[in-house]
């Protein structure tokens, strides 16, 4: 193998790997024909002048997870064939100017998870062929104008997990080939108008977990190819009416965890490829007519954990493809009988943790394919006669934690429940709240002094692909839940945000900071 250092392993395929704490300097002599070199998990603290001088055929160089804190400017001299260079997971605070000079073939440069305090235009001015630049997980507070001006071929730029407080509108102006821009987990409070105007080929823009309060109306108007836009966990309080109007390719939009108070009609659209919209954890108080009318392919709509008290009868117009609708943990007291009429393909609806006092008899009239309805923890005292009769596929119905009034008017509901007991699940059954003499007794077996014929309990369809329920009686909070936590439910196990119950502000469905996309 043309000489392999004792602390390394060398393969026939010209691959060299040097690992271990006993390594304190770049091993020598390295095989002259090496094409891939990995130096991982060592105690190397610095790279001196030209340690790779004799391996000029090198294509990939990974120097990761070391103690590296200092590099001399000529460390990578004579590596003109190098295409991939990773210095990730080290302790670099400063990059010397000219470090990447002569790396004319370099396409991928990974500098993530270091301690870099600043970058300068001169750092990357020689890297004209660079396609990927990873700078996430550093301590960058600002990006100077011109920093990326020479990287005209760049397709992927990650600046996430830094300390950026503002972005110059000119910093990305020459990156016309950029497809992925990640700015997540910074301290950005606003994005100047025009910042993304030059990014005509952008497909993914990650702005989640910042402190953005306002979006300028035309912020995304030049990004017609945008497919994924992450805006979750910011401080956005309103959406300018036209902000999403020029995004026909969008297939992922996250807005959860903001401060949105209202959504104007037609705010989303047209977005023919958007299939899921997550709007939970905002401050939305009402839904006007046609607010989602451009989202004709939407399959999943999550509106849980808002403050919705009013839904206009035409709010869900256009959502003909919707399969799952989550409205749990809001402030709904009443629903118009026609509000779900257009949702002909709806399978799962979660309305638990609201203040619903009654339901119109025709509320589910046109939603014949419903399989799961969550109505627990509301203020329901009774339900209209025949409200569920036409729902032949219904196999999960949650009615517990309501103040059922067990007088003679409850008989039709009681009889239906008796016939359909398997649909109620086995863990928690609805119980009477009034009159006082029957409080706490099961609604299904309560004696209301009227003879009830013996009934045959029919077989119920197997459980559907219902939304995410909690499978555990107590809900973990994000301070203690690891990212491997699985929430599973008492009856099913689909711990989907559409129906998860949340008992306090910390219980965000086992979601941790690491899970923010």
């Amino acid at each position: 193998y043309h000489g392999c250092p004792s602390e390394c392993t060398c393969s026939r395929a010209s691959q060299v790997e040097c690992t271990g704490a006993r390594i304190v300097a770049v091993p020598t002599p390295l095989p002259w024909n090496a094409m891939s070199l990995q130096i991982l998990n060592t105690h190397i603290t610095e790279l001196n002048e030209s340690p790779f001088l004799n391996i000029s055929a090198l294509i990939a160089l990974r120097i990761e997870k070391n103690e590296l804190s200092r590099i001399t400017p000529g460390a990578f001299r004579n590596l003109g064939s190098l295409r991939y260079l990773s210095l990730a997971n080290n302790k670099l605070q400063v990059l010397p100017i000219g470090l990447f000079q002569g790396l004319d073939s370099l396409e991928s440069l990974l500098l993530s998870s270091n301690q870099l305090l600043q970058i300068q235009p001169a750092h990357f001015s020689q890297c004209s062929n660079l396609k990927e630049l990873q700078l996430h997980g550093n301590h960058l507070e600002y990006i100077p104008d011109g920093a990326f001006d020479h990287l005209v071929g760049l397709t992927k730029l990650n600046l996430g997990k830094n300390s950026l407080t503002h972005i110059s509108p000119r910093v990305f102006q020459h990156l016309g080939n950029l497809q992925v821009l990640r700015l997540y987990e910074n301290r950005l409070t606003d994005i100047p108008m025009g910042t993304f105007d030059g990014l005509v080929n952008l497909q993914e823009l990650a702005l989640q977990q910042n402190q953005i309060g306002l979006l300028s109306p035309g912020l995304f108007h030049n990004n017609h190819n945008l497919q994924r836009l992450y805006l979750s966990n910011n401080h956005i309080s309103q959406l300018p009416p036209s902000v999403f109007m020029q995004l026909p390719q969008l297939n992922r939009l996250t807005l959860f965890g903001n401060s949105l108070k209202e959504l104007s009609p037609g705010i989303f659209g047209p977005m023919p490829n958007l299939r899921e919209l997550w709007l939970y954890d905002n401050h939305i108080s009402s839904l006007p007519d046609n607010v989602f009318s451009n989202l004709r392919q939407l399959q999943v709509l999550i509106l849980s954990r808002n403050q919705i008290s009013f839904i206009s009868p035409g709010a869900f117009n256009g959502l003909t493809e919707l399969r799952e609708l989550s409205l749990h943990t809001n402030a709904l007291q009443d629903l118009d009988g026609n509000v779900f009429r257009m949702l002909a393909n709806l399978q799962n609806i979660s309305l638990q943790n609201n203040r619903l006092r009654q339901l119109p008899g025709n509320i589910f009239a046109n939603v014949n394919g419903l399989m799961a309805i969550q109505l627990q923890n509301n203020q329901l005292e009774n339900l209209p006669l025949g409200i569920f009769d036409h729902l032949g596929k219904l196999c999960e119905l949650r009615l517990y934690d309501n103040p059922w009034r067990c007088d003679s008017d409850i008989l039709p509901l009681r009889n239906w429940l008796l016939l359909n007991q398997p649909r109620l699940g086995t863990d928690t059954v609805p119980v009477c709240f009034s009159p006082a003499n029957v409080r706490g007794q099961s609604l299904i077996i309560i004696n209301v002094n009227v003879a009830v014929p013996s009934v045959h309990v029919p077989e119920v369809p197997s459980y559907p692909e219902t939304p995410w329920y909690p499978d555990t009686p107590s809900y973990p909070d994000t301070t203690s839940v690891s990212s491997t936590t699985e929430l599973t439910s008492p009856v099913e196990d689909y711990t989907d945000l559409t129906t998860i119950q949340v008992t306090d502000d910390r219980s965000v469905w086992g979601m941790t900071q690491a899970q923010s996309g």
């Epitope: 004709r296 999943v300 003909t320 559907p464 839940v481 990212s483 491997t484 929430l487 989907d496």
Partner: antibody, heavy 119, light 110 residues
Framework: EVQLVQSGAEVKKPGSSVKVSCKAS????????IHWVKQAPGQGLEWIGL????????NHNQKFKGKATLTVDTSTTTAYMEMSSLRSEDTAVYYC????????????WGQGTTVTVSS | DIVLTQSPDSLAVSLGERATINCRAS??????????MHWYQQKPGQPPKLLIK???SLESGVPDRFSGSGSGTDFTLTISSLQAEDVAVYYC????????FGGGTKVEIK
């Protein structure tokens, strides 16, 4: 390049458990659904369930409820499926696969992990 | 659960000829916009590979000799001109409810 790399073949005794891993790379792990599919020897495909790494939420085929536990570790972009109380009929190749949206097709698949249950 | 019945179980077709595989669902898996039916190809010792999603949408990178059609309960996968590398088992899958697969159709060269 999108890749799902699964752990190696396992031979297990009846009554024991096995944990199969699926390491994802080349895409944003938390942004996709991860499905698990069973294929018994000479048989067709059977959907076990899915996990959504963004929230750790799961959905099982009722047949595998109590048999398969699906979890994720987002720090290592790895999905896991643990099968408990193994029986001979659990002998199969198990695949993980990726789906863009919940109802979408599975567009990338792992190479499969063979689990053999034998005394 | 929705039952998917594929026909035929196996199919022998000459190179360059058309191959047609059918999949019937026990209930409709379509809306006015979409059919929640997908097609996969599996070669021996390999994982399945997505060919067609939502009944008729060709997955990127898949040769255009593959096409899908149908709605409601009846769906078809067509290979317009069979190539040697198309020898495999083909499966339909529905994602309307709990996902289920068809039993598979083995395609061979005559």
């Amino acid at each position: 390049e999108v890749q799902l790399v699964q752990s190696g073949a396992e031979v297990k005794k009846p009554g024991s458990s096995v944990k199969v891993s699926c390491k994802a790379s080349g895409f944003t792990f938390t942004d996709y659904y991860i499905h698990w599919v069973k294929q018994a020897p000479g048989q067709g495909l059977e959907w076990i369930g899915l996990v959504y790494p963004y929230i750790g939420g799961t959905n099982h085929n009722q047949k595998f409820k109590g048999k398969a536990t699906l979890t994720v570790d987002t720090s290592t972009t790895t999905a896991y499926m643990e099968m408990s109380s193994l029986r001979s009929e659990d002998t199969a190749v198990y695949y993980c696969a990726r789906g863009d949206n919940k109802y979408d097709a599975m567009d990338y698949w792992g190479q499969g992990t063979t689990v053999t249950v034998s005394s | 659960d929705i039952v998917l019945t594929q026909s035929p179980d196996s199919l022998a077709v000459s190179l360059g000829e058309r191959a047609t595989i059918n999949c019937r669902a026990s209930q409709s898996v379509s809306t006015s916009s979409y059919s929640y039916m997908h097609w996969y190809q599996q070669k021996p010792g390999q994982p399945p590979k997505l060919l067609i999603k939502y009944a008729s949408s060709l997955e990127s990178g898949v040769p255009d000799r593959f096409s899908g059609s149908g709605s409601g309960t009846d769906f078809t996968l067509t290979i317009s001109s069979l190539q040697a590398e198309d020898v495999a088992v083909y499966y339909c899958e529905q994602s309307w409810e709990i996902r289920t697969f068809g039993g598979g159709t083995k395609v061979e060269i005559k």
